[in-house]
Amino acid sequence: VKMAETCPIFYDVFFAVANGNELLLDLSLTKVNATEPERTAMKKIQDCYVENGLISRVLDGLVMTTISSSKDCMGEAVQNTVEDLKLNTLGR
Amino acid sequence: EICPAVKRDVDLFLTGTPDEYVEQVAQYKALPVVLENARILKNCVDAKMTEEDKENALSLLDKIYTSPLC
């Protein structure tokens, strides 16, 4: 949950690619005004997930979740929250 | 803002070699089945995507990272 808060559109696109859902990918890419060549590139990546099957998608989703919830990322998120609190306090 | 570790993972997935990408994944999930899958996906992406495709994927990632939705 926390990871999606850091950059929701990234995780939208990533999970659309990994799920192999072309419609979902198109919807996500429309949100960032993706060009046709950019869409083509992402669909080539999506093809690899589709070709390698469900287990492959699950395993790569697990990797992304693990990285996103690792101390490397969570430490960063906590640090950002602390900075935000400081700024808010100073702003008053 | 996207976490630098996630950004590095995606960058290596697109622009690195299979060795580099798998090494990066291993720092977070060192299960043989996960690493083998990472190598398979990376090999597939390298075989499918041209230099132009990868440039386009990188430009899309830039749009994502700088989007108000990120």
Partner: antibody, heavy 120, light 106 residues
């Protein structure tokens, strides 16, 4: 056009050291991964090492690990191979080769090679 | 370490004949297999990348196929200038070359 020119080869005694250089031109050197590959006289090709575009990542074949070091100087458009503890079996023509951008074509351009002879 | 085994080691062929060289990997490498041509006293040249993609400037008589562990380089109508040694290279896990296949003209 892409040009890779190796230099620094020569005759060296077993246990000795040598540093090979590869001067690159005709492309943006700092964007490309680079390799060293060797070929013993009358034998096949053997990949030795590669280095990432920024120089932060290096990989080696088991046969040279711990003895050879690959490095690069992007400001000078140069690739290097420091070879220590040389053995007779390291005698070969050493080639530097470029990878296509973003790992799109390993070994797409090669230099003409430089001969290293290890003998007492 | 991934081992690549090429066959045959040597092939003597007449011009216009079709040449087939195979490369077998000791484990699956997807499509991360590349073919090189080396003429005597020259450095190698890339012919085919990622199993089946022709490199720029390579004559159309050269083609590649395969995936996983079994790969093939085909020279459709051999020309005299094709006399050379052909090597496969895998880039899936570090890099390793096959032992080479020497093709000469009868």
């Amino acid at each position: 056009q892409v040009q890779l020119v190796e230099s620094g080869g020569g005759l060296v005694k077993p246990g000795g050291s040598l540093r090979l250089s590869c001067a690159a031109s005709g492309f943006t050197f700092s964007d490309y991964y680079m390799n060293w590959i060797r070929q013993a006289p009358g034998k096949g090709l053997e990949w030795i090492s590669y280095i990432s575009s920024g120089g932060s990542t290096t990989y080696y074949a088991d046969s040279v690990k711990g003895r050879f070091t690959i490095s690069r100087d992007n400001a000078k458009n140069s690739l290097y191979l420091q070879m220590n503890s040389l053995r007779a079996e390291d005698t070969a023509v050493y080639y530097c080769a470029r990878d296509g951008k973003y790992n799109t074509s390993p070994g797409d351009y090669w230099g003409q090679g430089t001969l290293v002879t290890v003998s007492s | 370490e991934i081992v690549l085994t090429q066959s045959p080691d040597f092939q003597s062929v007449t011009p216009k004949e079709k040449v087939t060289i195979t490369c077998r990997a000791s484990q699956s490498i997807g499509s991360s297999l590349h073919w090189y041509q080396q003429k005597p006293d020259q450095s190698p040249k890339l012919l085919i990348k990622y199993a089946s993609q022709s490199f720029s400037g390579v004559p159309s008589r050269f083609s590649g196929s395969g995936s996983g562990t079994d790969f093939t380089l085909t020279i459709n109508s051999l020309e005299a200038e094709d006399a050379a040694t052909y090597y496969c290279l895998q880039s899936s896990s570090l890099r390793t070359f096959g032992q080479g296949t020497k093709v000469d003209i009868k």
